[in-house]
Interface confidence: low
């Protein structure tokens, strides 16, 4: 027989089907022009010494082969003696150690059979009612379509799917959408009404991720406040990436998950921008405030659940670092400013209240006066810290005030409100003898002394009512008791106890009337 | 910073197409998620249709409820353009259309980067 021919004779081996798991496999046969023809196969197991024969049955029930030798694909024209205008049935045999070994069978019509491409182009991927859909380009020439899908995760073994018949020039298919793993496509194509035709080639890998990504497993931690008044926050473990089945490994092409972090400043709730996503690998700087952080995870399908965290305020105060003045035409504080066209944002609240009650009030853009300080005033109208008790002071600067992670931290203070001079005026002040020349001096506790840092001293007054001489006496703030001493017996004396801040004297008490009253020796 | 700047908007009658394009220039384009966003007066903004960067040979698309099939979003990264064809046009598509990048998500909310928008109006 001539090689170009399909040879009708007794293959030169003997029909023994060996039965093994190896062999030939994945059988093709195309028209690859208007006179040519190819079939193409794979054969798994070891190659050496291994001879090809493509078998061919006609309608009639005459048989032939071409011997392909080691090769795994093979040429011939319409005039090999092949009927290509009817039915035929081919199959491969491999020859090796003595033994046979037989593909499968496929049986077509050559002529009308098209070698047929799988999805080339761009594979677009969409979510459409809990399930996938792909859609990509027909291949130039190849309108009408059987297609099928096969698809695995990182656990599971390839899975066959059909994706119907196509019919346009846009093909799509609606395949299974996994909730928590990731999954791996391959599509492959064939000439549709083509009774027998062969499969196309898988197409490269479609990686999708799972419809919801995965749950962040993250942890924080946030350093101390630095002298500029931020702290950064850090990422103690990072996200656990998605397990990819093998073809989407390396490059993951599509199955990435995202991690965002979420900022929510809470405090100073009159700014422009209460909230900042970032991502995950750029931990921000932030200031004193309180946050809510949250870590978003996000795939092409959308964002997954999230983690929130609620990072405090950072309450270490600074007592001196705030001046404040009460005039009759409002209140005034004065702080170190921070630089030139500074927004600054003063937000109080009445201690031992929800965080709910805050309130703030946000600066236009200032400069330092000349004495290098930032001013804020209010009205006694407007009911800023109008009532008398102790509030909580923070003060924010930012240069943007439009971007929440560039704001710091001023300082945080307490400040009694209202007539504080007036309310923390010392109550039940009372005398007791102590000595033949002294006395002790007792009072209860100033309301200014629930505020922390506010209350500087207090200072006791003692009036010699005879000579109208004057003593004074400073009491550390933790004190509510002092002894007078160098007293006279028989002279009237008044006693009055006043309670100071740093920037106001406080009133005095009523006047407490005393006498150490004469020892007469017997 | 990304700039948008969308065309292509007009008048049309009920069961046309129009064609609508974003120009982007800034930052990369491709890092973005690029959408199509829709606002008629009184109502909420919407998604009309995302397209995702592409990934290897493959590219993310997910559209709005009431757009899918009639509406295809693409994207042209070399361009840094992104398109919206719109066929079958019907009254109730008459909004103003904006262009947006940020991250995959059909909410709007999501979108860091707006264009200035361009009205489309369908008469019956």
């Known amino acids: 027989c001539r090689t170009s021919e399909c040879c009708f004779q007794d293959p030169p081996y003997p029909d023994a089907d060996s039965g093994s798991a190896s062999g030939p496999r994945d059988l093709r046969c195309y028209r690859i022009s208007s006179d040519r023809y190819e079939c193409s196969w794979q054969y798994e197991g070891p190659t050496a010494g291994v001879s090809h024969f493509l078998r061919c049955c006609l309608s009639s029930g005459r048989c032939c082969y071409f011997a392909a030798g080691s090769a795994t694909r093979l040429q011939f024209s319409d005039q090999a003696g092949v009927s290509v205008l009817y039915t035929v049935t081919l199959w491969v045999e491999s020859w090796a150690r003595n033994q046979t070994e037989k593909s499968p069978e496929v049986t077509l019509q050559l002529y009308n059979s098209v070698k047929y491409e799988p999805p080339l182009g761009d594979i677009k991927v969409s979510k459409l009612a809990g399930q996938l859909r792909m859609e990509w380009e027909t291949p130039d020439n190849q309108v009408g379509a059987e297609v099928q899908f096969r698809h695995r995760t990182p656990s599971s073994p390839w899975k066959l799917g059909d994706c119907g018949p196509q019919d346009d020039d846009t093909e799509s298919c609606l395949c299974p959408l996994e909730m928590n793993v990731a999954q791996e496509f391959q599509l492959r194509r064939r000439q549709l009404g083509s009774q027998g035709s062969s499969w196309s080639k898988w197409s490269s890998p479609v990686c999708v991720p799972p419809e919801n990504p995965p749950q962040p497993q993250v942890r924080f931690s946030v350093e101390q406040l630095g002298q500029d008044g931020r702290r950064r926050l850090t990422l103690k473990e990072q996200p656990t990436q998605l397990e990819l089945p093998e073809g989407c490994q390396g490059l993951a092409p599509g199955t990435e998950v995202t991690y965002r972090l979420q900022l929510h400043m809470l405090s100073c709730p009159c700014k422009a921008k209460a909230t900042r996503t970032l991502h995950l690998g750029k931990m921000p700087y932030l200031s004193g405030a309180a946050y809510n952080v949250a870590v978003i995870s996000s795939n092409q399908f959308g964002p997954g659940l999230n983690q929130t965290w609620h990072i405090p305020a950072d309450t270490h105060t600074e007592p001196v670092a705030l001046n404040i003045s009460v005039g009759t035409n409002g209140t005034t504080m004065y702080w170190p400013a921070r630089a030139q066209s500074m927004t600054y944002c003063i937000e109080w609240q009445p201690v031992g209240q929800d965080g709910g009650l805050a309130t703030c009030s946000l600066t236009a853009p200032q400069d330092p006066d000349p004495a290098g300080m930032a001013t804020y005033s209010w009205s006694r109208e407007s009911g800023a810290m109008g009532q008398e008790k102790c509030y909580y002071i923070t003060i924010f600067a930012s240069a943007h005030p439009e971007k929440l992670t560039l704001w710091s931290t001023v300082l945080s203070t307490y400040h009694f409100g209202g007539n504080a001079s007036a309310a923390g005026t010392p109550h039940h002040v009372s005398v007791k003898n102590h000595s033949l020349d002294s006395v002790s001096v007792d009072w209860a506790p100033s309301l200014l002394s629930t505020c922390p840092g506010v209350l500087k001293e207090y200072v006791v007054r003692c009036r010699d009512e005879d000579s109208k001489q004057v003593s004074e006496h400073p009491v550390q703030p933790t004190e509510t008791q002092v002894t007078l001493s160098g007293l006279r017996a028989g002279v009237a004396y008044t006693v009055q106890v006043r309670a100071d801040t740093a920037w106001l004297r406080g009133v005095w008490s009523q006047p407490q009337r005393f006498s150490i009253e004469v020892q007469v020796s017997d | 910073q990304v700039q948008l700047v969308e065309s292509g908007g007009g008048l049309v009658q009920a069961g046309g197409s129009l064609r609508l394009s974003c120009a982007a220039s800034?930052?990369?384009?491709?890092?973005?998620?690029m959408g199509w966003f829709r606002q008629a007066p009184g109502k909420d903004r919407e998604v009309v249709g995302i397209?995702?960067?592409?990934?290897?040979?493959?590219?993310?698309?997910d559209y709005g409820d009431s757009v899918r099939g009639r509406f295809t979003i693409s994207r042209d990264d070399a361009k840094s353009t992104v398109y919206l064809q719109m066929n079958n046009l019907m009254p109730e598509d008459t909004a103003v259309y904006y262009c947006?990048?940020?991250?995959?998500?059909?909410?709007?909310?999501?979108?860091?980067?707006w264009g200035q928008g361009t009205q489309v109006t369908v008469s019956s």
């Open positions: 947006a990048a940020g991250a995959f998500r059909t909410d709007w909310r999501s979108y860091a980067y």
């Open positions: 397209a995702a960067w592409k990934v290897a040979s493959t590219y993310y698309v």
């Open positions: 800034g930052r990369t384009f491709r890092t973005y998620a």
